[in-house]
């Protein structure tokens, strides 16, 4: 069904401006490279309008093209630390359903202590996004240093 | 078909698509870590549609969730310079009203000469955003190396 | 004034939500610093809705303010390699028509192997965007490491 036809008398919700901005809750147990996120007004400036959290991972509720963005800063880090613990890598991907599993965005820290990037990608209702941080260094939980979000852009 | 023709019963203002992209004007005097921005068609590719500049700082005119983005490149910089002058840090935050003062986004340069990031954040009418660059290195004023902008995303 | 009330008679096309996300096809021949891009559902998660590719370069079809974003990762790269081959620089600009030629966004790799940034910029129908990578290092063609996209934001 074309968006244009359904679009004629539609309120904000139907425009599908789903959006979420999350802050880091915690890292996973040993052998689980995933970062676990949290969001909501009680936590400060994080929020979920449309997408939901499922055990700390972000689940999409509306099909469309999304802008996905992330910043992760390593805690207790200097360029020396970063290069000594290289490679520390951050990957954002669809981790479920398994049939749609794919890496969407990947960066290594090399001699830096922060990575930040963004990209446009099609996502479908039910896609769960996971952010995997591999390496021994811990991410900062400061809300201005580590965050992850999505923004619905168009059908 | 031009957007304007199809647009006749919808003033753009009501869409709330406030947006601004600024270029660096100058750094502050000693003891003032703020960067001072400028924008407008006479200056090239910078612009303000909705938000305003107040003494070089960006003031928001419409409540909503915004995508805030920034890139700052240090002038006369190499990885050696950057690490020797470490820590050089860039922070973007709400600096007024004082009651809403908070750091939204923070990055250190470590051994790099450019930082770039973006995030979604709720902003309210009257919020003024400040960008603080701490350290002794100067930012480049080249318009393709240093810029700061906001984009209204949804109410 | 609520967006929902004003929204009632606007089809998607007239909203002008042109958007594209491209993956790297190849680098240019000797003496051509341009990166050549490709996009489309057959290639995975890249797409063009509005803009077009012209010999691997992105051509804009609708006037407006766009969010331009890019990530480029160097292949076979370590912080040592990156600094040894310095300066490796990535620039995104309007390369045609010649009368509008300008650099929009520029970053150097220094000791890092990935650059990522984004900015808002006015673009006009017919503008062709080129991404120039100067230096001897090759970019990764992995779709989660190197990508380039634009998103129409407002008229």
């Amino acid at each position: 069904q074309r968006f244009a036809q359904a679009q004629q008398q539609l309120p904000l919700e139907s425009l599908g401006w789903d959006v979420a901005e999350l802050q880091l809750n915690h890292t996973g147990p040993q052998q689980d490279p995933r970062l676990y996120w949290q969001g909501g007004p009680a936590l400060g400036r994080s929020f979920l309008h449309g997408p939901e959290l499922d055990k700390g991972q972000l689940r999409i509720h509306r099909d469309g093209i999304y802008m996905v963005h992330i910043q992760v800063t390593l805690a207790i880090c200097s360029s020396t630390t970063a290069s000594r613990h290289h490679p520390t890598t951050l990957a954002v991907g669809i981790c479920s359903p398994a049939s749609r599993s794919i890496s969407l965005l990947r960066l290594s820290f090399h001699q830096g202590c922060t990575i930040a990037s963004q990209r446009l990608t099609p996502l479908a209702r039910g896609d769960t996004l996971c952010t995997n941080l591999t390496g021994t260094l811990l991410p900062s939980r400061n809300t201005d240093e580590t965050f992850f979000g999505v923004q619905w852009v168009r059908p | 078909q031009r957007f304007a023709q199809a647009q006749q019963q919808l003033p753009l203002e009501s869409l709330g698509w406030d947006v601004a992209e600024l270029q660096l004007n100058h750094t502050g005097p000693q003891q003032d870590p703020r960067l001072y921005w400028q924008g407008g068609p006479a200056l090239g590719r910078s612009f303000l549609h909705g938000p305003e500049l107040d003494k070089g700082q960006l003031r928001i005119h419409r409540d909503g969730i915004y995508m805030v983005h920034i890139q700052v490149t240090l002038a006369i910089c190499s990885s050696t310079t950057a690490s020797r002058h470490h820590p050089t840090t860039l922070a973007v935050g709400i600096c007024s009203p004082a009651s809403r003062s908070i750091s939204l986004l923070r990055l250190s340069f470590h051994q790099g000469c450019t930082i770039a990031s973006q995030r979604l954040t709720p902003l309210a009418r009257g919020d003024t955003l400040c960008t603080n660059l701490t350290g002794t290195l100067l930012p480049s004023r080249n318009t393709d190396e240093t810029f700061f902008g906001v984009q209204w995303v949804r109410p | 004034q609520r967006f929902a009330q004003a929204q009632q008679q606007l089809p998607l096309e007239s909203l002008g939500w042109d958007v594209a996300e491209l993956q790297l096809n190849h680098t240019g021949p000797q003496q051509d610093p341009r990166l050549y891009w490709q996009g489309g559902p057959a290639l995975g998660r890249s797409f063009l809705h509005g803009p077009e590719l012209d010999k691997g370069q992105l051509r804009i079809h609708r006037d407006g303010i766009y969010m331009v974003h890019i990530q480029v990762t160097l292949a076979i790269c370590s912080s040592t390699t990156a600094s040894r081959h310095h300066p490796t620089t990535l620039a995104v600009g309007i390369c045609s028509p010649a009368s509008r030629s300008i650099s929009l966004l520029r970053l150097s790799f220094h000791q890092g192997c990935t650059i990522a940034s984004q900015r808002l910029t006015p673009l006009a129908r017919g503008d062709t965007l080129c991404t120039n990578l100067t230096g001897t290092l090759l970019p990764s063609r992995n779709t989660d490491e190197t990508f380039f996209g634009v998103q129409w934001v407002r008229p």
């Epitope: 490279p33 290289h86 490679p87 794919i102 591999t134 | - | 990762t73 292949a75 076979i76 790269c77």
Partner: antibody, heavy 118, light 107 residues
Framework: QVQLQQWGAGLLKPSETLSLTCAVY????????WSWIRQPPGKGLEWIGE???????TNNPSLKSRVTISLDTSKNQFSLKLNSVTAADTAVYYC????????????WGQGTLVTVSS | DVQMTQSPSSLSASVGDRVTITCRTS??????LNWYQQKPGKAPKVLIY???TLQQGVPSRFSGSGSGTDFTLTITSLQPEDFASYYC?????????FGQGTKVEIK
């Protein structure tokens, strides 16, 4: 210094399954592509496939669906299984690390000669 | 798949000679080409990546050139330790493919 050490059965009968394991020492497992490459006696090199540390694998279509590459990140090991082998699969099998973005095989195992004979 | 054609398949040369090996690909691959050296009973070793970048620790008598579909490996002054087999390999796409090899023998 990164070292790759590989092991597995060297003599197989047709229709059996080839099974090799490669252990990575002295370096990180994450951030790299881990590959298998083979070389029939007196011939050139053939890429079998690779697996990224996240578990995503890509195989050479010429080997159809006979190939399975898996990894065990807890042991810093990755493995190759090639089923329904024939004499044409007789070769020296190498494990190798695909550096950074998988664009260069910068570290190799010592190689294992696998002979398929009835 | 990208087909790789290496020539010659073998050559005889003397110490001090200049040796050139060529590699042609069936489609455009930019500069996504590596060169490896392999000695009998040993694993291959990278010499050149990205068509022309010398791998750290490799002597400067080795050089690579070309882009697109035609590539060359040159050894300016052949040394005794250079007698070996040489392979080109494309990393433009999967499956990664190798040339059939060039064996450099002592004349």
């Amino acid at each position: 210094q990164v070292q790759l050490q590989q092991w597995g059965a060297g003599l197989l009968k047709p229709s059996e399954t080839l099974s090799l394991t490669c252990a990575v020492y002295g370096g990180s497992f994450s951030g790299f592509y881990w590959s298998w490459i083979r070389q029939p006696p007196g011939k050139g090199l053939e890429w079998i496939g690779e697996i990224y540390h996240s578990g995503h694998a890509t195989n050479n279509p010429s080997l159809k669906s006979r190939v399975t590459i898996s990894l065990d990140t807890s042991k810093n090991q990755f493995s190759l299984k090639l089923n329904s082998v024939t004499a044409a699969d007789t070769a020296v099998y190498y494990c190798a690390r695909g550096g950074n973005s998988g664009y260069i095989f910068d570290y190799w195992g010592q190689g294992t000669l696998v002979t398929v004979s009835s | 798949d990208v087909q790789m054609t290496q020539s010659p398949s073998s050559l005889s040369a003397s110490v001090g000679d200049r040796v050139t090996i060529t590699c042609r690909t069936s489609q455009y691959i930019g500069r996504y080409l590596n060169w490896y050296q392999q000695k009998p009973g040993k694993a291959p070793k990278v010499l050149i990546y990205g068509a022309s970048t010398l791998q750290q620790g490799v002597p400067s008598r080795f050089s690579g050139s070309g882009s697109g579909t035609d590539f060359t490996l040159t050894i300016t002054s052949l040394q005794p330790e250079d007698f070996a087999s040489y392979y080109c390999q494309q990393t433009y796409s999967t499956p990664r493919t190798f040339g059939q090899g060039t064996k450099v023998e002592i004349k």
